[in-house]
């Protein structure tokens, strides 16, 4: 058993049928010595008397808010949550496996640049009685500071019969140098509590590996005289690290017909312009990627050929 | 990645082309190592990230773009010293800091070159003959060093009398390649920045 926060305790249980569970001793936070009784949640049934209460915690029915009273007055509370260990592996019931970029990915994180600011998100099908708290650091043995905001519900979508909820959090490394070569990964830890179930999820990454630039901005077409060709031009996104000559991007320019089956013409360039043939009803899209470290491509920025 | 290879024009900062080749070569070598050593811990998540140049050179600090010198987090360990000649210095206006930067890059390359050559000698003794260093990568390191053209003491190749532990050598190779790739990215960024300046 360990304390999650004041008066909230997590009981770790080896979770299998007929498991013996864990013996827990609760102590009433009071100078009083006698006349103390204990109850669980809203029930008025007295579970025991005395300054301490010993319970065998086996299942969720044994978890909840234990309260000690004296003469009708509440003295203190202890909330017990359960953390299930199933065959040596902590349960992951609360969050959905996003399966990207690999199986068992519960937290996904992205950064728009090298400033040390990043966003993480996760999915769940649970809509109520759910709380998250997020902590982060650079390295784990001698951790350096990363400050995270509160997790917020950022999207809701319907998936088949289920509603899916996306939560996200923004974090900022306290003293980040965009040009630094990372040797210690960023660690992100999310505590999730659903009703009386506690779970924790972690992700470890280097900012360089989660970079995903914003799409190029100001995408424009300039027709070339007496030609089917157009000059496409764009700019670096505002959110990208500066100076751009140091934090350079490379670009992919794509000409896509109306039909998805039509052959796509693609050109790769380090410049912020390219000359392409603009077909009727086609659209031109440009995306960006760090020129020197191949992390994710940005989403496409698009304009119609017409 | 299907990127066209840029051919530098003659007036271009002479080292940019070499640094692009370096990054390409080390990235290819790392990919090859990951595939060949699939049963060894060779991914970014599995290895310890060590920097053999730590406390010996200060490339990131010495090569910091002017725009980032205002960022206090980037100025934790700025050091000044090093040699100040070199053929990449295209104009007399080149500052002391630029010379310092390029000489730091040269020292990095020299240290990695020695490590890689020592490691290759060990790998050649492996009865499994599982993996060797790409000669192209070693050649590209050499070319960039020549283009930087700093006069510096030659570091003797380390020789070891004891029987090599091939498992440890291959893990060390992965660690070295990951670190060298990160340094090659920094070198490319620096060359691109200097070229634009």
């Amino acid at each position: 058993i360990w304390e999650l926060k004041k008066d909230v305790y997590v009981v770790e249980l080896d979770w299998y049928p007929d498991a013996p569970g864990e013996m827990v001793v609760l102590t009433c936070d009071t100078p009083e010595e006698d006349g103390i009784t204990w109850t669980l949640d809203q029930s008025s049934e007295v579970l025991g008397s005395g300054k301490t209460l010993t319970i065998q915690v086996k299942e969720f029915g044994d978890a909840g808010q234990y309260t000690c009273h004296k003469g009708g007055e509440v003295l203190s509370h202890s909330l017990l949550l359960l953390h299930k260990k199933e065959d040596g592996i902590w349960s992951t019931d609360i969050l959905k496996d996003q399966k990207e970029p690999k199986n068992k990915t519960f937290l996904r994180c992205e950064a728009k640049n090298y400033s040390g600011r990043f966003t993480c998100w996760w999915l769940t099908t649970i809509s109520t009685d759910l709380t998250f708290s997020v902590k982060s650091s650079r390295g784990s043995s001698d951790p350096q500071g990363v400050t995270c905001g509160a997790a917020t519900l950022s999207a809701e979508r319907v998936r088949g019969d289920n509603k899916e909820y996306e939560y996200s959090v923004e974090c900022q490394e306290d003293s980040a140098c965009p040009a630094a070569e990372e040797s210690l990964p960023i660690e992100v830890m999310v505590d999730a509590v659903h009703k009386l179930k506690y779970e924790n999820y972690t992700s470890s990454f280097f900012i360089r590996d989660i970079i995903k630039p914003d799409p190029p901005k100001n995408l424009q077409l300039k027709p070339l005289k007496n030609s089917r060709q157009v000059e496409v031009s764009w700019e670096y996104p505002d959110t990208w690290s500066t100076p751009h000559s140091y934090f350079s991007l490379t670009f992919c320019v794509q000409v896509q017909g109306k039909s998805k089956r039509e052959k796509k013409d693609r050109v790769f360039t380090d410049k912020t312009s390219a000359t392409v043939i603009c077909r009727k009803n086609a659209s031109i899209s440009v995306r960006a990627q760090d020129r020197y470290y191949s992390s994710s491509w940005s989403e496409w920025a698009s304009v119609p050929c017409s | 990645r299907n990127l066209p290879v840029a051919t530098p024009d003659p007036g271009m900062f002479p080292c940019l082309h070499h640094s692009q080749n370096l990054l390409r070569a080390v990235s290819n070598m790392l990919q090859k190592a990951r595939q060949t050593l699939e049963f060894y811990p060779c991914t970014s998540e599995e290895i310890d990230h060590e920097d053999i140049t730590k406390d010996k050179t200060s490339t990131v600090e010495a090569c910091l773009p002017l725009e980032l010198t205002k960022n206090e987090s980037c100025l934790n360990s700025r050091e000044t010293s090093f040699i100040t000649n070199g053929s990449c210095l295209a104009s007399r206006k080149t500052s002391f800091m630029m010379a310092l930067c390029l000489s730091s890059i040269y020292e990095d390359l020299k240290m990695y070159q020695v490590e890689f050559k020592t490691m290759n000698a060990k790998l050649l003794m492996d009865p499994k003959r599982q993996i060797f260093l790409d000669q192209n990568m070693l050649a590209v390191i050499d070319e960039l060093m020549q283009a930087l053209n700093f006069n510096s003491e030659t570091v003797p190749q380390k020789s070891s009398l004891e029987e090599p532990d091939f498992y440890k050598t291959k893990i060390k190779l992965c660690i070295l390649l990951h670190a060298f790739r990160i340094r090659a990215v920094t070198i490319d960024r620096v060359m691109s920045y200097l070229n634009a300046s």
Epitope: W15, P17, F60, K85, D87, N103 | -
Partner: antibody, heavy 115, light 112 residues
């Protein structure tokens, strides 16, 4: 004490269907994940499928994906394995078992796929 | 499709020490716990070892498990006639959990 009693095995022709059941007692069935494991005659153990305690997630071995469906009825304390498009290579003793560091197995039920 | 490799058979005389190996990889035994089962003819498997080296109550202490790197082993010190059975190791793969990975199985024969 924990008990898992299996039923539903038998002889079936290739291409036909069969449903296996596993009745649980002696524990809170709705709190635990459950597996199906099979063993072809004279062969080793092979995992078939898993279902979470609440039925929200199901996992299958590649060899049965798209043909077998694992399900549970927590109100009846019963686990099921619906097997469709059966093949000769599905012939095996099928076991249900609880998920956890200490596990309990059903007695096994024989499924023979033969024409 | 078996990723965990065991020797097909091992044998020993009563009282001898018998060991069975189970070889896997970094993503299974290397990073997950291992179980061992005993299966007597015509019966369901019985758990002998969980969590690499833990014995459930009721399992004789002549059975012991260990794990090192990407391999695990089961030792029977002072093997007895009633130990003649098939033995299976089981683990998970970190990418496909909760799918169970079973070893190929080892037939233990007690001679004499």
């Amino acid at each position: 004490q924990v008990q898992l009693v299996q039923s539903g095995g038998g002889v079936v022709q290739p291409g036909r269907s069969l449903r296996l059941s596993c009745a649980a007692s002696g524990f809170t069935f709705s709190s635990y994940g459950m597996h199906w494991v099979r063993q072809a005659p004279g062969k080793g153990l092979e995992w078939v499928a898993f279902i979470r305690y609440d039925g929200s997630n199901k996992y299958y071995a590649d060899s049965v994906k798209g043909r077998f469906t694992i399900s549970r009825d927590n109100s009846k304390n019963t686990l099921y394995l619906q097997m469709k498009s059966l093949r000769a290579e599905d012939t095996a003793v099928y076991y249900c078992k609880t998920h956890g560091s200490h596990d309990n197995w059903g007695q096994g039920t024989m499924v023979t796929v033969s024409s | 499709s078996y990723v965990l490799t065991q020797p097909p058979s091992v044998s020993g005389t009563p009282g001898q020490r018998v060991t069975i190996s189970c070889s896997g990889g970094r993503s299974n035994i290397g990073s997950q716990t291992v179980k061992w089962y005993q299966q007597l003819p015509g019966t369901a498997p019985k758990l002998l070892i969980y969590g690499n080296d833990q014995r459930p109550s009721g399992v004789p202490d002549r059975f012991s498990g260990s794990k090192s790197g990407t391999s695990a082993s089961l030792a029977i010190t002072g093997v007895q006639a009633e130990d003649e059975a098939d033995y299976y190791c089981q683990s998970y793969d970190r990418g496909t959990h909760p799918a169970l990975l079973f070893g190929t199985g080892t037939k233990v024969t007690v001679l004499g």
